[in-house]
Amino acid sequence: SQVSQNCHNGSYEISVLMMGNSAFAEPLKNLEDAVNEGLEIVRGRLQNAGLNVTVNATFMYSDGLIHNSGDCRSSTCEGLDLLRKISNAQRMGCVLIGPSCTYSTFQMYLDTELSYPMISAGSFGLSCDYKETLTRLMSPARKLMYFLVNFWKTNDLPFKTYSWSTSYVYKNGTETEDCFWYLNALEASVSYFSHELGFKVVLRQDKEFQDILMDHNRKSNVIIMCGGPEFLYKLKGDRAVAEDIVIILVDLFNDQYFEDNVTAPDYMKNVLVLTLSPGNSLLNSSFSRNLSPTKRDFALAYLNGILLFGHMLKIFLENGENITTPKFAHAFRNLTFEGYDGPVTLDDWGDVDSTMVLLYTSVDTKKYKVLLTYDTHVNKTYPVDMSPTFTWKNSKLPNDITGRGPQ
């Protein structure tokens, strides 16, 4: 049902859902700090534009009595319960920030007449694609899938002269929320990734993965997995790996690779790491000082959500337009705004665009190096290192099927 919004007469409120179940195990206090830091910036920007208005956030906390797993498994109803709480209290703001779990976002979108925008730090799954009033500020699974298909098809680079059409996907069910939905998208038989590949098998047991590493009868040389180097080591250890195996390690929200003193462990030599290009600042921010790299991205997405709202509010106020309209609710897409760490671009469906970076380990220096970058906005790959010092034969990525000639 329609809920009256605290969103007029020079006073604009943001409803922030503080859910016990979250995409990342982040203390809610840190998210509050990120939101408050964002509010300070927004107030400054509006004031500089000569707009004398009030912008505040209301934090809506779940009671945590029923939905207390802490991860996303029991989040489906928590979001709806919080919306009911907002509705009963007549405390809906101009915009809803949160939830971050795919289950809860999907259910909230389905079960409510949303005449206000929803901004999510998460909601990675394909089921949250193409939602008219949902904006996602962390790379969703669709973006990963498009990169992988693009990279698989590429065959005209000095270091990749074969198109690939096969893959194993390792998915054992213990993944973090982002990895769960990324791998879920790759596994789905109706997804773009599955449609474009000729062969794809999901490995669910550690032993299956370990056996493939040296199996002469394997159907693909390429294995996709999601997590950090430690996760890979737990699984692979120091086992021997066939020389034409390529492991693609998806680790988007981890900038440990971009620390100056990092040396790649030996077990990473057959691995290409897919991560996001690191931001430029952030390190001195009060909200991010004590956060791990992943959590920094999560808190940053909350902060950028506030900045995005401020950006849209400014545009609508300057144009003398009403905020509590479907036009406002549908406007949070196909735009670039000034984020905390530089410009942030949203695509036609309100999903954040970014630069993904594919790293390899140099056999000469044992350091991570950039092989190529990929711009999700234009779905294009840009090679950076034309003569990489790979572990693979002739410093070229192998064919995805052993013994198959040039494609």
């Epitope: 971009f258 620390e259 100056d260 290009s277 690191p278 970076v357 350091k367 991570y368 190096k369 950039v370 092989l371 970058t373 840009y382 950076v384 290192d385």
Partner: nanobody, 123 residues
């Protein structure tokens, strides 16, 4: 002796493309952060792209999505691919190198500079 030599400049129509090269000698490009700069007539020199020694490209907003940078260590050469060129891209383009202290950040200043190559975008 450390040397950087740019080539590939010329006259191109708006919307056209060019590829500039920067050949290095006397040192290994791979160990250095490399920047492309440009100076338009009567204007200050400005940074266009930097490639950190770890290989991370960082672009000026004015060229993002149009210019790309790559490195071929076997030829000790850096490339700047410029697409969708505009009249305002007309300038002398310089490449510069810095013995990097950070693998992932652009240096505040560069030690070695090339002589530059002229790019003119005009119909």
């Amino acid at each position: 002796e450390v040397q950087l030599v740019e080539s590939g400049g010329g006259l191109v129509q708006p919307g056209g493309s060019l590829r500039l090269s920067c050949a290095a000698s006397g040192f290994t490009l791979d160990d250095y952060a490399i920047g492309w700069f440009r100076q338009a007539p009567g204007k200050e020199r400005e940074g266009v792209i930097c490639l950190t020694s770890g290989g991370l490209p960082k672009y000026a907003d004015s060229v993002k999505g149009r210019f790309t940078i790559s490195r071929d260590n076997s030829k000790n050469t850096l490339y700047l691919r410029m697409n969708s060129l505009r009249a305002e891209d007309t300038a002398v383009y310089y490449c510069a190198a810095s013995g990097a202290t950070s693998r992932w950040n652009c240096p505040p200043q560069y030690d070695h500079w090339g002589q530059g190559t002229m790019v003119t975008v005009s119909s």
